[in-house]
Interface confidence: medium
Amino acid sequence: MATARPPWMWVLCALITALLLGVTEHVLANNDVSCDHPSNTVPSGSNQDLGAGAGEDARSDDSSSRIINGSDCDMHTQPWQAALLLRPNQLYCGAVLVHPQWLLTAAHCRKKVFRVRLGHYSLSPVYESGQQMFQGVKSIPHPGYSHPGHSNDLMLIKLNRRIRPTKDVRPINVSSHCPSAGTKCLVSGWGTTKSPQVHFPKVLQCLNISVLSQKRCEDAYPRQIDDTMFCAGDKAGRDSCQGDSGGPVVCNGSLQGLVSWGDYPCARPNRPGVYTNLCKFTKWIQETIQANS
């Protein structure tokens, strides 16, 4: 999930070909994808941007959210984890339940029409008893977000109804404290588990990462880091990747960040994942939910 990645459109083309051949699960949105003009930056939104239909508000350079070298999450441990789906069941981004009727995700995950799946453990569309399905009825990107660039990469999504709280579906609090270097966090998602190859997991993946210092973050991504972002990673080649975008980074029991962007391929040495720094946005989140409820 980095910013300065080599061209990745060939990955999309290969994926789309594979999808058409029925080789892989329906994970990517692939309408109207052009294989021209490869981009060098890759947000972690992964699949979402991979195949934005014409006219949709998607960033074609955002394909870096993913969990590399993580492990299967324990069931019921991430009840705030949401999947954003295009028809029929194509996951394009992760999201996080922060209120009974509101999700947070990355602004670069914006689509016009999508569904939301909560309480689901596997990537496949097979019915699970704890799942709850919703429509996204309103998407509100942060006003400071603009493409290109990765600042203020967050968006609120209003669901068509309130969730029914269960052991599989419940909100998480957004941290008002900014992360410190060395803080241990957990990132989760259904993004690709390999990079630059693409391989999607059967079930939700979890990965322990550590918040890195601002200096290391700035050094990894010169002139691209500001205080709306933080870096986190793992020296052993573990990272989030394509498809994880918008998903949660949980530290000390509260939501600290969202998968935003990173380097491509994912999990490169000294190229940590970059996450939306939610402590900077607690006021905006609260006020926006109140104003639109």
């Epitope: 410190s180 601002q214 290391r216 990894a220 991504y221 002139r223």
Partner: antibody
Framework: VKESEGGLFKPTDNLTLTCTVS????????VTWVRQAPGNGLEYIGF???????YYASWAKSRSTITRNTNLNTVTLKMTSLTAADTATYFC?????????????WGPGTLVTVSS | NIVMTQTPASVEVAVGGTVVIKCQAS??????LSWYQQKPGQRPKLLIY???TLASGVPSRFKGSGSGTQFTLTISDLECADAATYYC????????????FGGGTEVVVK
């Protein structure tokens, strides 16, 4: 890692010091400039990362510029409007940001004296 | 703005003794702290990085500990050659800070 010769400067003069490195690439390591006034402690001036971005101490920001030339393996510190308070030994040091080893190789330092 | 406060400013210890130098950061810096030794007229030398990792060639008599905001350098079995000034240095951020170094601790060996 070695700093260029310092010397005697007058107040309001501009200072240019060059740090020449060998045995490693500036594309893989940062360089930090530090100074030490006579009898005083170490004082951070600024840092240039492996990606080429420069960052500065708050007191140095308005009158310091750090640049690099990866082909020549040099890092340059420019400081404008010198005053007597800038009299110090100036050090450059390799900054191993990625490896976490911080300032692991230091130059011998060069003395800069500012006096009218 | 992260401020590094180092104590004591000076300490006198007998050969074979132990000296403890403390460094406090004004905010959490994780383990992004290193320690340097500087002898008069010489360049600083890296002793400890990542708060507790011994740099290459440094004797195990030097020990770093701590994380977050409180850090300690302990020198045991003090030798005459350990007489020097010791500095802590935060490596958490390099931008817009007043100084990344502590004020220094002069160790005098009796």
């Amino acid at each position: 890692v070695k700093e260029s010769e310092g010397g005697l400067f007058k107040p309001t003069d501009n200072l240019t010091l060059t740090c020449t490195v060998s045995g490693f690439s500036l594309s893989n390591y940062g360089v930090t400039w530090v100074r030490q006034a006579p009898g005083n402690g170490l004082e951070y001036i600024g840092f240039i990362g492996s990606g080429g971005s420069a960052y500065y101490a708050s007191w140095a920001k308005s009158r310091s510029t750090i640049t690099r030339n990866t082909n020549l393996n040099t890092v340059t510190l420019k400081m404008t409007s010198l005053t007597a308070a800038d009299t110090a030994t100036y050090f450059c040091a390799r900054d191993d940001v990625g490896g976490g080893k911080s300032l692991d190789i230091w130059g011998p330092g060069t003395l800069v004296t500012v006096s009218s | 703005n992260i401020v590094m406060t180092q104590t004591p400013a000076s300490v006198e210890v007998a050969v074979g003794g132990t000296v403890v130098i403390k460094c406090q950061a004004s905010q959490n810096i994780g383990d992004y702290l290193s320690w340097y030794q500087q002898k008069p007229g010489q360049r600083p030398k890296l002793l400890i990085y990542s708060a507790s990792t011994l740099a290459s060639g440094v004797p195990s008599r030097f020990k770093g500990s701590g994380s977050g905001t409180q850090f300690t350098l302990t020198i045991s079995d003090l030798e005459c050659a350990d007489a020097a000034t010791y500095y802590c240095h935060q490596d958490y951020t390099s931008n817009d800070v007043e100084n990344t170094f502590g004020g220094g601790t002069e160790v005098v060996v009796k």
